[in-house]
Each structure stands twice: as C-alpha cells, then as structure tokens.
C-alpha cells in the first residue's frame, strides 16, 4: 500500500525517502519512478543515483538532501495535476530480493484562489470592460481588455494600480509580510 | 569507538553569548548531519537544528533561528552551538547528537547551560 | 510543524508485565519514526529507528511497530532497569520534532 503525500500546484512536492549506509560511503543505488514499484528496478525512472553520484535525473527533479548520508528525499519542483501519482523510491540494496521499497501517492491539489486585493476590484468595478485574470506560477499573467472611453491619466493611474496589486501578490505567494 | 564528547559546564549573564562545542572521535562529521537538542530540568527534548559539515548546509527550528547558530570544523571534527542574547529560558542542558540520517544514533553527554545574573 | 502527541505521559507498571507507549503524528510521517528511551540523570538512547528497526545492543523485549500517523513501544517482560523516560521522534520533516515523553516507574 502507498503512503499519501499532498502539494499544490505551483509549489514544490516534497517525497521523503531515506536508508542507513552500511558506513560512510559505503552507498547503494537508489531509483526513484512513476508508477508503482515492479518488481524489479523502477519504471519510468524519474532520478537515479550510483555507489558515487546523482547519475541521471529529468528536469524539475532533485534530490534535496545528502544523497551521501542516505537522504534520498525526492523533490518535484513546480508542480501540476499531472504530476498526481504514484512514486517508487527503491533502495537497492545488494543480494537477492534486499531491495526496499516506498510507494509514495502524490495528490496535487489546485492552488488556492486568493481573492483580488480591494483596490483592484473597485479598478475593476469602475472599469468594466477590463478583464483582470490572476494565475499561478511563472506563466502568471494579468490581462487587459479594450478600454476605448478611459483617458491617459486613468490608465497611468491604473497601471500604477495593477502593478501594486501584482507586486502584493507576488509578495504574498512567497510566504512574505506585507507591512 | 563513536564518542561525542561536549565541553564543560556555563554560567553566563543574561544578554551574553555562549559557545558550545561538541568533539567527534571514532568517525568523521563530515560523513554525517549534527544536531544540537534542548533539554530543560525535568522537560522533554527540542531541536535546535543540524549543519551538514560536508557543506555546511544549517537547518533550524523557526524557535532557535536568531537565538543558535551552528558551527562545523572538519579540521578539529569539531560541532558547535552558538547562543546568543542569553535569558533564564535559555537554561537547560544542550546536546549534540549525530543522525544516519533522520535518527539520532549518538549522542554527547550534555553541557549544563545556566543563565543567572 | 509536525506535532508528536504521545501517551499516556506517566505509567507504573509491575516488573514482569508488558507495557505499551502510543506517539500520534500531526500527519503523514510513513515509518520515518525513532524511539529513545532516557534513565534518571542520562543522555538519550536510540532503541528503536524506522518505527520497529530494534538498534543494535537494544534487548529484544523492546519492540515498535506503526505507520503512517499511529505508532507504538511495547515492552514485555518489564526489568527494573527498564525505569526511564521514552520518547518518540519524527525524522521525515524539518524541523524534526519529539513526543512529550512517557515516564515509566515500576510499581
């Protein structure tokens, strides 16, 4: 049976994996993959190590701690719905059928919607023709409609006004106050 | 034969530093995480955080972050906790621990810290 | 943070009896749990790691056993040297966290 660990998009997944080296350096290769553990190997290797190194890896996947010290926590970096699934991290001890096996289940939930700063809907209500959308992560984009009866200086004003709500946004997303 | 051996017992002012240190024998910090843990007269056990000495890579618990700060020497095979700003809530027995690697397999003997003016 | 509830906080037990220590994970820790176990006056010592791993020299008559939120400490056959303080640890998360610690006396 699997173990559920949840994230949301846009953030980072964090599937913690770990095993005791014999002695230091004395290490073992460790798959990670999508898909329930085979009984053998990983299938759809996402991250690999060896005796030494990090040998193969796909974007987006990292290892975060100390491979070195038997941390072999997976991190899946920036994550959508498709990332929802089942993950083997198996730990490749030698001689017959040693392995250990860890079927993590990744539930990816939709980012929160965080409703528009007060500014902005009253921008919004006063101008109904323009179309503000508020995504998530780097493809975030905020998108204006026509506005033929506004005049120079409430569009600068505007501007102005989008761009601080932006930036509270941005702010408020990386975990920062805003004083 | 693993040992952890601690420095010696403090007393200290309120508002001053202090340093503890924390000597490895019988392996190499370098190949492990060193954790530093809390333990008030008759309390449980808090962690303050690990430094991986290979890349002195610090890890706190948001309760220590300004209060500890941790130190590695791979020449000396020497850990070492820093506390600084010291109250009587600071007053406890400090303990340096070694993991392999979410686990504390070894731990020192404990350094006696007391605050008092 | 992860919270570790563990209980009962205090026991007494007679020498010879079989005891259980329960830690409760605020979430998800799979088997990243360790228990130790502190004597009056002594550090702490690693019995047990990945929840019902037993650490070398440990005596057998400590065993672990759980997973995911739910875990437990069972010691059988109770010896007097067994008078101590057990906690649990969680391994899996930053900042690491431990239980509040079980007192064990003998009746």
């Known amino acids: 049976s699997e173990v559920e660990y949840r994230a949301e998009v846009g953030q980072n997944a964090y599937l913690p994996c770990f095993y005791t080296p014999a002695a230091p350096g004395n290490l073992v290769p460790v798959c990670w993959g999508k898909g329930a553990c085979p009984v053998f190997e990983c299938g759809n290797v996402v991250l690999r190590t060896d005796e030494r190194d990090v040998n193969y890896w796909t974007s987006r996947y990292w290892l975060n701690g100390d491979f070195r010290k038997g941390d072999v926590s997976l991190t899946i970096e920036n994550v959508t719905l498709a990332d929802s699934g089942i993950y083997c991290c198996r730990i490749q001890i030698p001689g017959i059928m040693n392995d250990e096996k860890f079927n993590l289940k990744l539930v990816i939930k939709p980012a929160k919607v965080t409703p528009a700063p007060t500014r902005q809907r009253d921008f919004t209500a006063a101008f109904p023709r323009m179309l503000t959308t508020r995504g998530h992560g780097p493809a975030e984009t905020q998108t204006l409609g026509s506005l033929p009866d506004i005049n120079l200086t409430q569009i600068s004003t505007l501007a102005n006004e989008l761009r601080d709500s932006r930036l509270a946004n941005d702010l408020r997303d990386s975990g920062a106050t805003i004083r | 034969e693993v040992q952890l051996q601690q420095s010696g017992a403090e007393l200290v002012r309120p508002g001053a530093s202090v340093k503890l240190s924390c000597t490895a024998s019988?392996?190499?910090?370098?190949?492990?995480?060193m954790h530093w843990v809390k333990q008030r007269t008759e309390q449980g056990l808090e962690w303050i955080g690990r430094?991986?000495?290979?890349?002195?890579?610090?890890k706190y618990a948001p309760k220590f972050q300004g209060k500890a700060t941790l130190t590695a020497d791979t020449s000396s095979n020497t850990a070492s906790l820093q506390l600084s700003g010291l109250t009587s809530e600071d007053t406890a027995v400090y303990y340096c621990?070694?993991?392999?690697?979410?686990?504390?397999?070894?731990w020192g003997q404990g350094t006696t810290l007391t605050v008092s003016s | 943070d992860i919270q570790m509830n563990q209980s009962p906080s205090s026991l007494s037990a007679s020498l010879g009896d079989t005891i259980t220590i329960t830690c409760h994970a605020s979430?998800?820790?799979?088997?990243?749990l360790s228990w130790y176990q502190q004597k009056p006056g002594n550090i702490p010592k690693l019995l047990i790691y990945?929840?019902?791993n037993l650490h070398t020299g440990v005596p057998s008559r400590f065993s672990g056993s759980g997973s995911v939120t739910g875990f437990t400490l069972t010691i059988s056959s109770l010896q007097p040297e067994d008078i101590a303080t057990y906690y649990c640890?969680?391994?899996?998360?930053?900042?690491?966290?431990f239980g509040g610690g079980t007192q064990l006396e003998i009746k």
């Open positions: 019988g392996f190499n910090i370098k190949d492990y995480y």
């Open positions: 990945k929840a019902s």
């Open positions: 621990a070694r993991s392999s690697p979410y686990y504390f397999d070894y």
């Open positions: 979430q998800n820790i799979n088997v990243w």
């Open positions: 430094i991986d000495p290979d890349n002195d890579e610090i």
């Open positions: 640890q969680q391994g899996q998360n930053i900042p690491y966290t």
